[in-house]
Each structure stands twice: as structure tokens, then as C-alpha cells.
């Protein structure tokens, strides 16, 4: 368990031409608030899909009234952090959507009017317990600057908040097999033993001996997939054999989503999928027009000239979604070579290379011999992320530092005697044989099987093998 924290630093006009209209005016003062939606993994999901990791709304910011003639400044922000608690392990990779909302404070009948000013989306990798990560995202002419982090709630620790820490029972050291808990060195990692047989994939425990099921699984050991097909009703009787959902009122009962929105349950509450032109937690907000700039990433907005007509975003290549807020999965083209893992970071593709490879697309087979010297005249041979030395005569070992015995393999044939020599070995041949390894017989008539002995050498002389 833990908390994802989001700190908004600024929201205002981005750099470059085409500064956005101020969202507030002297006639219609307004204030901002933010909504964050988190989803696990790096999936390309629709903005309307459930915020499976959780969602949060900020407080309302200070009331802002535009000063006539002044350029739109950074707008006043709500105080405090947006906090999204997560009950299970932190997934490490996540998708986020941050929406900036405007609340108009004029004399509207029926209370304040809400409208969506900007929505940014992204996908990131983040380890729990790490430092604040800073980010800048642009939506149309607006720019949002923010920081985020994930932190574990005690007693959980670790990059996924799955390890538990307990105060030390003894002041000096932890019990057998238990490690100190970094960064809480005065605490020890606690052994957490779930109920015997609890599914490691679909179950977890926060207390020893229990087995709690992830969404979609049921049964005492979380081994039964939830299925409503065999139930008497969509929320029929609970049974470990049928895997039916537990009875009782659900968060979507009565459909809390307005304006034709469809409701889907989340682990904590519900999520409304709104028809085009409606937004908000319950699809209660309407009136987004092309003038509000709802299309991101250079999308072209058509229609939606007035709040009663829907707009359509025509997305540029590489983007999709009702607001062009999602990137196409470019990694499906598998641009990384040599088994590298592709990561689509939005602004660029990155490849995580296997050992032995490097480069932006893992295209370089690392020079295994770089910086590796083979001693005594040996030469380095590359291969498969490791290096090997091919040693000169008389030397051996991984780096050719060991002096080899060239006579160990008995290289002299026909009873020749072997002598080690600085440049290799020398064979002293037995009578009747000659050659570097005494491999050639001398014919009885004195003629050699070789065309002729080298000058200065007589048959039977030791031959030096070079």
C-alpha cells in the first residue's frame, strides 16, 4: 500500500505564438481545480477507461479575475498535493491523465459551471520511494508543470511497496534470514507469509495468514476467476465453485452517470464513460466546444461551434483517441535490434539493450575486446558478449599470462625428444626421421621424403618448429 502524490507547480500559457484566451474575465471570475487519473502499466487506454490505480480531485484554487489588457499569466493554483492512495503493490509503470478544470463563479442558475480547460496524458516508469520526478506537458497553447512521486505507507517499503518492515526486536541486528530495511536501517524486513496455497498471481496478504484476492478472482485461495455467466443475476450468490460475484448493492446500481454515460465499477468506486461532449466524474459537465481547444497534440477540431453540438478531433499521424491524447503503439514495429526492449516514452522511442549490445537501437555489438589486453603477444577474439584470448605459442590461460609447456602434448612423433624453446618447441628426432615434428621418415637410400633439407640442416638434426 502507498500513495501517489502529484504537485502542480504552474498552469499557464505555453511558449511560442498563439497565447490562449484567459479562462476568466471580470464579468465571469473563475477558479481552477485539477483531476488526476492513474492506470497501471504502459497500456494505450482511452481517456475514458477506468482509472484502475485510482483518481483524485484537487481543492479549488483561488478566485481569479482577468486584468483587462494584461497577458494571461500563470493561473493561481489550489493548495496542497493531489494524493491517490493505492492498496496493492505499486506497478512501477503507469499511465496518467491530468485534467485542468475551470469553475465559473458568475450568476449561473443551478450553481457554478464547469468546463475542461486542458487534458494531458503520459506514460512513465517510477519506482516507489524515489525522489520527486519533474515533468512539463503541453495541451494546445497551455503548459502544465508538475512533479510526482510514489511513496509507501508504513510498514510497506521497497520499489513496489511489497516488503514490510517492523521495528527491531533486538537493538543490534535483525533475526535470522532477515535484512535491515533500507532506508529505515533501524527496522527489519518482516517475513510475510500468506495463507498456505494463496495464489501468488491473484492473491496477496497484508497480514500473515490471510489471502486477499485481486479484482477478478475469488475463492479462499484466489484461484477461481470471477464470472457472472453462471449466476442467477449479475450480482448473484457467492460461491467458490461458480465464482459468482458477492451479492449486495454495487457502486453502479442506479447508474450515477448522467447524460447517457455508462458506469463501470473500479476497486474503490465507479468510473463513468461519458458520451462525446460530456465530462466530469458523473458526466454532469457539458459545453466543451472547439473554442476550448479540446484536441491535443495538434489535432484539428471540427464542429462543436456551440455547447449543444459535439466536436470531433481529427488527429495528426501518430495520435489517436477522442481528444488525440493517446500515442499509437510505435513499439509494435519492433524497432529495437538484437532482442532489445522497446519503450515508447512519448517524445521518443528508447531501447533497453541486452547484455553485449548498445546504441539507440541496440545496433552495436559491444567490442568485447575493448580495454582487454591479451599478454605475451596474444590476440583477442570477440564473441557473444565475452572475450577470449588466442595465445601465442608457449603461453596459455585466460589472458595468456601463464607460460605453457609446449611439450605437454607430446608433439614429436616417432620417439622424437621435445625441448621447450623461447619461440615454441624443438624436436630432436630419432634416427631415421626428420621434420619439424619428426613426422617424415628418411628413406634407407638416404633420400628424404621431403624434397630437400633446408640449408645447414642435416637429416636427424633437431628441427626448430616456428
Amino acid at each position: 500500500a502507498g500513495v501517489f502524490e502529484l504537485q502542480i507547480h504552474s498552469f499557464g500559457p505555453g511558449p511560442g505564438p498563439g497565447a490562449p484566451r484567459s479562462p476568466c474575465s471580470a464579468r465571469l471570475p473563475c477558479r481552477l481545480f485539477f483531476r488526476v487519473c492513474l492506470k497501471p502499466g504502459l497500456s494505450e487506454e482511452a481517456a475514458e477507461s477506468p482509472c484502475a490505480l485510482g483518481a483524485a480531485l484537487s481543492a479549488r484554487g483561488p478566485v481569479y479575475t482577468e486584468q483587462p489588457g494584461a497577458p494571461a499569466p500563470d493561473l493561481p493554483l489550489p493548495d496542497g498535493l493531489l494524493q491517490v492512495p493505492f492498496r496493492d503493490a505499486w506497478p512501477g509503470t503507469f499511465s496518467f491523465i491530468i485534467e485542468t478544470w475551470r469553475e465559473e463563479l458568475g450568476d449561473q442558475i443551478g450553481g457554478p459551471a464547469w468546463s475542461l480547460l486542458a487534458r494531458v496524458a503520459g506514460r512513465r516508469r517510477l519506482a516507489a520511494g524515489g525522489p520527486w520526478a519533474r515533468d512539463i506537458q503541453r495541451a494546445g497553447a497551455w503548459e502544465l508543470r508538475f512533479s510526482y512521486r510514489a511513496r509507501c505507507e508504513p510498514p510497506a517499503v521497497g520499489t513496489a511497496c511489497t516488503r514490510l518492515c517492523r521495528p527491531r526486536s533486538a537493538p543490534s541486528r535483525c533475526g535470522p534470514g532477515l535484512r535491515p530495511c533500507a532506508p529505515l536501517e533501524d527496522e527489519c524486513e518482516a517475513p510475510l507469509v500468506c495463507r498456505a496455497g494463496c495464489s501468488p498471481e491473484h492473491g496477496f496478504c497484508e497480514q500473515p495468514g490471510e489471502c486477499r484476492c485481486l479484482e477478478g478472482w475469488t475463492g479462499p485461495l484466489c484461484t477461481v476467476p470471477v464470472s457472472t455467466s453462471s449466476c442467477l443475476s449479475p450480482r448473484g450468490p457467492s460461491s467458490a465453485t461458480t465464482g459468482c460475484l458477492v451479492p449486495g448493492p454495487g457502486p453502479c446500481d442506479g447508474n450515477p452517470c448522467a447524460n447517457g454515460g455508462s458506469c463501470s465499477e473500479t476497486p474503490r468506486s465507479f468510473e463513468c464513460t461519458c458520451p462525446r461532449g460530456f465530462y466530469g466524474l458523473r458526466c454532469e459537465v457539458s459545453g466543451v466546444t472547439c473554442a476550448d481547444g479540446p484536441c491535443f497534440n495538434g489535432g484539428l477540431c471540427v464542429g462543436g461551434a456551440d455547447p449543444d453540438s459535439a466536436y470531433i478531433c481529427h488527429c495528426p499521424p501518430g495520435f489517436q483517441g477522442s481528444n488525440c491524447e493517446k500515442r499509437v503503439d510505435r513499439c509494435s514495429l519492433q524497432p529495437c535490434r538484437n532482442g532489445g526492449l522497446c519503450l515508447d516514452l512519448g517524445h521518443a522511442l528508447r531501447c533497453r539493450c541486452r547484455a553485449g549490445f548498445a546504441g539507440p537501437r541496440c545496433e552495436h555489438d559491444l567490442d568485447d575486446c575493448a580495454g582487454r589486453a591479451c599478454a605475451n603477444g596474444g590476440t583477442c577474439v570477440e564473441g557473444g558478449g565475452a572475450h577470449r584470448c588466442s595465445c601465442a605459442l608457449g603461453f596459455g590461460g585466460r589472458d595468456c599470462r601463464e607460460r605453457a609447456d609446449p611439450c605437454a602434448a607430446r608433439p614429436c612423433a616417432h620417439g622424437g625428444r621435445c625441448y621447450a624453446h623461447f619461440s615454441g618447441l624443438v624436436c630432436a628426432c630419432a634416427p631415421g626421421y626428420m621434420g619439424a615434428r619428426c613426422e617424415f621418415p628418411v628413406h634407407p637410400d638416404g633420400a628424404s621424403a621431403l624434397p630437400a633439407a633446408p640449408p645447414g640442416l642435416r637429416p636427424g638434426d633437431p628441427q626448430r618448429y616456428l
Epitope: L333, Q334, P335, L349, R361, E363
Partner: nanobody, 120 residues
């Protein structure tokens, strides 16, 4: 800057064939990966066929045996031969390329798309 220009789209009857072409031009040092995506109305864009970074070919399950991707390295061009076309193949087909530029950076580029309509 790199441009991807697609051609060959059009209207065809079920069972018919079309051949799409995509030519890459600009400050290209090499083409690392190149292929075809498609997007039907209201659907996600999906990879249809491509040459991966390791130069192997990759096909979506739904087009295996019907579509064939080929390339002309000298012309920096890829082709998609589509046969036995079905109504569900109707979509805008986009060319995509992961390109190593002359400055050695890698960038991912998209074409503007060409419409393929399959109807009786």
C-alpha cells in the same frame, strides 16, 4: 526532415487486390524499421505488417496469408500487396518508419495515410 508518401489506396470489391506503396525521402542515413499501420473508424491504430529493426517481417494475425510486405532498399520504399480483401480491411492505411537521420539520431515518422475501402 523526412517525408513518407503513400499511394495505391482506393475502392475495391471483396476478394479483390490492391498494392500500396510508401516512399521515404529526406535526410535519411538508414531506415531501421518500416511498415504499415491501419485505423478503422472508431478503432485503435494497429500494425498490419512491417520490417522490424532486425529486418524480420511481422504480420497481424488477421492478414497472415493474405497480405505480403516487401521492400526496395535502393528506393527506400516498402510495398504492401493486399489480396483476398474483406470488408473489415476497410481503413486508412498509414506508412510508418523508424529512421536514422544523417545526424545519427533516430526518429519515428508517419505518412498522411491512404484510404482503402472494401465494399460490394
Amino acid at each position: 526532415e523526412v517525408q513518407l508518401v503513400e499511394s495505391g489506396g482506393g475502392e475495391v470489391q471483396p476478394g479483390g487486390s490492391l498494392r500500396l506503396s510508401c516512399a521515404a525521402s529526406g535526410s535519411i542515413f538508414s531506415i531501421n524499421a518500416m511498415g504499415w499501420y491501419r485505423q478503422a473508424p472508431g478503432k485503435q491504430r494497429e500494425l498490419v505488417a512491417g520490417f522490424t529493426g532486425d529486418t524480420s517481417t511481422k504480420y497481424a494475425e488477421s492478414v497472415k496469408g493474405r497480405f505480403t510486405i516487401s521492400r526496395d532498399n535502393a528506393k527506400n520504399t516498402v510495398y504492401l500487396q493486399m489480396s483476398s480483401l474483406r470488408a473489415e480491411d476497410t481503413a486508412v492505411y498509414y506508412c510508418a518508419a523508424d529512421v536514422q537521420l544523417l545526424n545519427s539520431d533516430y526518429e519515428f515518422y508517419w505518412g498522411q495515410g491512404t484510404l482503402v475501402t472494401v465494399k460490394p
